[in-house]
């Protein structure tokens, strides 16, 4: 239904707290360099204006679209061109082009310092002094670093943060209470960020149809007892919610997400038997819980997939009558039978089935042609299964850090032209798949591994798009989203690469490395490892292990030495010489 004032409608639906949080996220995701105070001022102005519209929907400007209202606010910021360069040109455009322009200027890798967590005491002091401002800072800092973070989900993480601080700041040992809990939230939020970015990429590059196919597969796996009409309705609604969030329409997105959660809880009987626990929770927790609810039990009496999609003489007729519906039904039926497959794999199978029908239905005897289609799925299924087995075996043997290093070597060989920081970030993220997925039961490993890897590789593609340097990466990133992971896996050593010359300074370290936190130490060592591979792309695993062991020993010795600086300056050059010899 149309509302006289869109802003009043959203304010009423969402309530002041969520309204302000979402407006802050929106502004922080569009203008990523502005300070918290600048954005907080704008948020307050927008909120005050929304309140005047609630009081009188006919008041001046209350009938304007949210894009117009928000865009006008952003464009009124002083020194916009000095701080944001060509983004200021967006302000010369009219809606909807202006909003599109803002979206195009979102930076996936903004040059902002890493978000450092203050020490426990300081954190608790500022939290107690002003919880609202403290949470505002959290939303601002996360949103500006992750310009596509799923806004209603970010409100959920802020709520989690709030609960942890409330609990831990009352403890005697604040540090040991806060650290593991906040680390857990941070890890989950980072995974949520890359997953949502993948959804927005799907929407941006391949349109709503591609995202809806993803949603149908995912929902069918989770709700195998829901019928196709129900899954289609949920997928359509979920597509709308994600389209809005990806498009910067955060108030509409959060409002529609709340509506979808309400619908699901009111229709549990036709959706799933597993929803009740989620539905008992308050809004943000409810929506979050529904998004990762466990799979319902599969119906026991499902007929073989072949009956309707291979053996039926009507296959081509049904396909001709409604291609998308027929393929959607296939995806639904296949997905509900395979919670053990990744969504990416299910979409590849649906694509293979579509290609088979396109070819076979044009023949004189289609059934003879498409009769073997299910057997042709076998290699497509085996490939990711082998990937999971090989990688989980390696993870179990090496542990997370060693596994990350193995991946780093592999990916540096595949795309040595990519910058070392990007390779290290990617390898560290890809390597976490072991800890995240390899410990799960067998039937959950494949969906966990492949869908997580796909999301991480999407980030690799986004970063590479800004400065394309590797033909290998360009090739894999320009294909369809579901083919990316197999494409990257299939890449081998880039034979066109001219090895980097050996620079001693790249491998020169100083005593300051000794006081770094373990994570930072690992990054330094992994940076050196990537540089070694760039110098000797065909170095054997044994050679690289020798060098890295020597390097670790050197760090250990010098960091324990009484005179660290002397140790580093005398032993460092010896290490460099030994490295060169080992790789010669």
């Amino acid at each position: 239904e149309a509302h006289k004032s869109e802003i009043a409608h959203r304010y009423n639906d969402l309530g002041e707290q969520h309204f302000k949080g979402l407006v802050l996220i929106a502004f922080s995701q569009y203008l990523q360099k502005c300070s918290y105070d600048e954005h907080a001022k704008l948020v307050q102005e927008v909120t005050d204006f929304a309140k005047t519209c609630v009081a009188d929907e006919s008041a001046a400007n209350c009938d304007k679209s949210l894009h117009t209202l928000f865009g006008d606010k952003l464009c009124a910021i002083p020194n916009l061109r000095e701080n944001y360069g060509e983004l200021a040109d967006c302000c010369t455009k009219q809606e909807p082009e202006r909003n599109e322009c803002f979206l195009q200027h979102k930076d996936d890798n903004p040059s902002l310092p890493p978000f450092e967590r203050p020490e426990a005491e300081a954190m608790c002091t500022s939290f107690k002094e002003n919880p609202t401002t403290f949470m505002g800072h959290y939303l601002h800092e996360v949103a500006r670093r992750h310009p596509y973070f799923y806004a209603p989900e970010l409100l959920y993480y802020a709520e989690q943060y709030n609960e942890i601080l409330t609990q831990c700041c009352a403890e005697a040992d604040k540090e040991s209470c806060l650290t593991p809990k906040l680390d857990g939230v941070k890890e989950k939020a980072l995974v949520s960020s890359v997953r949502q970015r993948m959804k927005c990429s799907s929407m941006q590059k391949f349109g709503e149809r591609a995202f809806k196919a993803w949603a149908v597969a995912r929902l069918s796996q989770t709700f195998p007892n829901a019928d196709f009409a129900e899954i289609t309705k949920l997928a359509t609604d979920l597509t709308k919610v994600n389209k809005e969030c990806c498009h910067g329409d955060l108030l509409e997105c959060a409002d529609d997400r709340a509506e979808l959660a309400k619908y699901m809880c009111e229709n549990q009987a036709t959706i799933s038997s597993k929803l009740q626990t989620c539905c008992d929770k308050p809004l943000l927790k409810k929506a979050h819980c529904l998004s990762e609810v466990e799979h319902d039990t599969m119906p026991a009496d499902l007929p073989a997939i072949a009956a309707d999609f291979v053996e039926d003489q009507e296959v081509c007729k049904n396909y001709a009558e409604a291609k998308d519906v027929f393929l959607g039904t296939f995806l639904y039926e296949y997905s509900r039978r395979h919670p053990d497959y990744s969504v990416s794999l299910l979409l590849r199978l649906a694509k293979k089935y579509e290609a088979t029908l396109e070819k076979c239905c044009a023949e004189a005897n289609p059934p003879a042609c498409y009769g073997t289609v299910l057997a042709e799925f076998q290699p497509l299924v085996e490939e990711p299964k082998n990937l999971v087995k090989t990688n989980c075996d390696l993870y179990e043997k090496l542990g997370e850090y060693g596994f990350q290093n193995a991946i780093l070597v592999r990916y540096t060989q595949k795309a040595p032209q990519v910058s070392t920081p990007t390779l290290v970030e990617a390898a560290r993220n890809l390597g976490r798949v072991g800890t995240k997925c390899c410990t799960l039961p067998e039937d959950q490993r494949l969906p966990c591994v492949e869908d997580y890897l796909s999301a991480i590789l999407n980030r690799v593609c986004l970063l590479h798009e800004k400065t394309p340097v590797s033909e290998h990466v360009t090739k894999c990133c320009s294909g369809s989203l579901v083919e990316r992971r197999p494409c990257f896996s299939a890449l081998t050593v880039d034979e066109t690469y001219v090895p980097k010359e050996f620079k001693a300074e790249t491998f020169t370290f100083h005593s300051d490395i000794c006081t770094l936190p373990e994570k930072e130490k690992q990054i330094k060592k992994q940076t050196a490892l990537a540089e070694l591979v760039k110098h000797k792309p065909k170095a054997t695993a044994e050679q690289l292990k020798t060098v890295m062991d020597d390097f670790a020993q050197f760090l250990d010795t010098c960091c324990k030495a009484a005179d660290k600086d002397t140790c580093f300056s005398t032993e460092g050059p010896n290490l460099v010489t030994r490295c060169k010899d080992a790789l010669a």
Epitope: Q313, C316, K317, Y319, A320, E321, C361, N365, P366
Partner: nanobody, 115 residues
Framework: EVQLVESGGGLVQPGNSLRLSCAAS????????MSWVRQAPGKGLEWVSS????????LYADSVKGRFTISRDNAKTTLYLQMNSLRPEDTAVYYC????????SSQGTLVTVSS
Amino acid sequence: EVQLVESGGGLVQPGNSLRLSCAASGFTFSSFGMSWVRQAPGKGLEWVSSISGSGDDTLYADSVKGRFTISRDNAKTTLYLQMNSLRPEDTAVYYCTIGGSLSPSSQGTLVTVSS
């Protein structure tokens, strides 16, 4: 919406000829193989002939081989069945179908072969 409309049926004497047409709409005609099936009075459906989307591959039931010719005009989205040397046992309602379908969704056209 997919629509198939058959025409060209009628009463003919044994040994004579008829040409059936099937006008198709609502789908990408050239992307689909097409078939003719028939149903004689009091009998089940019987497959007669099929043709690929491009028109360069054809199949016939043994009972009509050498007498019937299937063809298509993709520009006009029309399927044809040229029936020569008709026999009384060819009497049936003829339907065009998409792909290998044996269940017609159209009205069909009646062919009666009788002296």
